[in-house]
């Protein structure tokens, strides 16, 4: 079965110092799938920001960095100047 | 037991388009990711590129402008396409799966596996 | 994309142990732990022998082992067999547009 992991429940971020979010593909590989990545805030929503290749939700282009890892079979988000609105719990997933 | 099939013909004229086909059986096509390489008579082994079952590609820098993959996953094959071809391109092309997966489910990419049989093309008129 | 670099030949007799070098750069070899290396009988397909530098896929003799250090993989096989005798290939994954071969090295048991 398909399994994708968060490489940290918990990633703490300095303001205005990149950061990388990875999630690790399990049970399959990750170059076969489009990988999406959302961010849910304190209201509940789930807001999307980026999908393969190169797509990225209103608002974030500018601040996010989308790709994938082929050799480690990963998903990478990076967040290049991370401030206090980018708090929030953010999801990997992935369709065909 | 996963097997690969090769089928294309084995002699191209100079400056035209070399065609190969490569058919799955026996196993998942959509787990893996699959390449084609060359190896001229006498020589050594020479990636060409790969395909993804999304189809996405990558293709060797040196042969990208001349190189087209495409892949059908409903029919479990793969393709390749090599345009304006010379004598240099005269050798045994190979289809491969690329891949392993461990017990943990972790995938290991750039390992080949599987291998078709092998079709010698020759490239003369 | 340029070569990995093996020796052209590489001998031993039965029961010996032999190393096959595969020396890349900071590129390929250096920076993933993503060579793997194959067999080759005359009119045969490659064989995965090694995998992810040190790993064996099912079947393969635990005689066959490999390492890294650096830019150099190295393929190690022991107790050397008549059936041993063949083309080894070293190949290293060096980035999602590109992977390397070594040249080929040619393993003769005396």
């Known amino acids: 079965a398909i399994e994708l992991v968060p490489e940290h429940q918990t990633v703490p971020v300095s303001i205005g110092v990149p950061a990388t979010l990875r999630c690790s593909m399990k049970g399959e590989a990750i170059g076969n799938y489009y990988i999406n990545w959302y961010r849910k805030t304190q209201g509940n929503t789930m807001t999307f920001i980026y999908r393969e290749k190169d797509i990225y939700g209103p608002g974030f282009k500018d601040n996010f960095q989308g790709d994938i890892d082929i050799a480690k079979n990963l998903a990478v988000l990076k967040i290049l100047a991370p401030s206090e609105r980018d708090e929030g719990s953010y999801y990997c997933a992935c369709d065909t | 037991q996963v097997q690969l099939q090769q089928s294309g013909p084995g002699l191209v004229k100079p400056s035209e388009t070399l065609s190969l086909t490569c058919t799955v059986s026996?196993?998942?096509?959509?787990?893996?990711?699959w390449n084609w390489i060359r190896q001229p008579a006498g020589k050594g082994l020479e990636w060409i590129g790969r395909?993804?079952?999304?189809?996405?590609?990558n293709y060797n820098p040196s042969l990208k402008s001349r190189v087209t993959m495409s892949i059908d996953t409903s029919k479990h094959q793969f393709s390749l396409k090599l345009s304006s071809v010379t004598g240099a391109d005269t050798a045994v092309y190979y289809c491969?799966?690329?891949?392993?997966?461990?017990?943990?489910?972790?995938?290991?990419?750039?390992?080949?596996?599987?291998w078709g049989q092998g079709t010698m093309v020759t490239v003369s008129s | 994309s340029s070569e990995l670099t093996q020796p052209a030949s590489v001998s031993g007799s039965p029961g010996q142990s032999i190393t096959i070098s595969c020396t890349g750069t900071?590129?390929?070899?250096?920076?993933?732990?993503?060579v793997s290396w194959y067999q080759q009988h005359p009119g045969k397909a490659p064989k995965l022998m090694i995998y992810?530098?040190?790993k064996r896929p099912s079947g393969i003799s635990n005689r066959f082992s490999g390492s890294k250090s650096g830019n150099t993989a190295s393929l190690t096989i022991s107790g050397l067999q008549a059936e041993d005798e063949a083309d080894y290939y070293c190949?290293?994954?060096?980035?999602?547009?590109?992977?390397?071969f070594g040249g080929g090295t040619k393993v003769t048991v005396l």
């Open positions: 491969a799966r690329e891949g392993y997966y461990e017990s943990d489910g972790s995938f290991f990419p750039g390992a080949f596996n599987i």
């Open positions: 026996g196993g998942s096509i959509t787990s893996y990711y």
């Open positions: 395909i993804y079952t999304i189809g996405n590609t």
């Open positions: 900071s590129n390929d070899v250096g920076s993933y732990n993503l």
């Open positions: 992810a530098g040190s």
């Open positions: 190949c290293s994954y060096a980035g999602t547009t590109n992977v390397v």
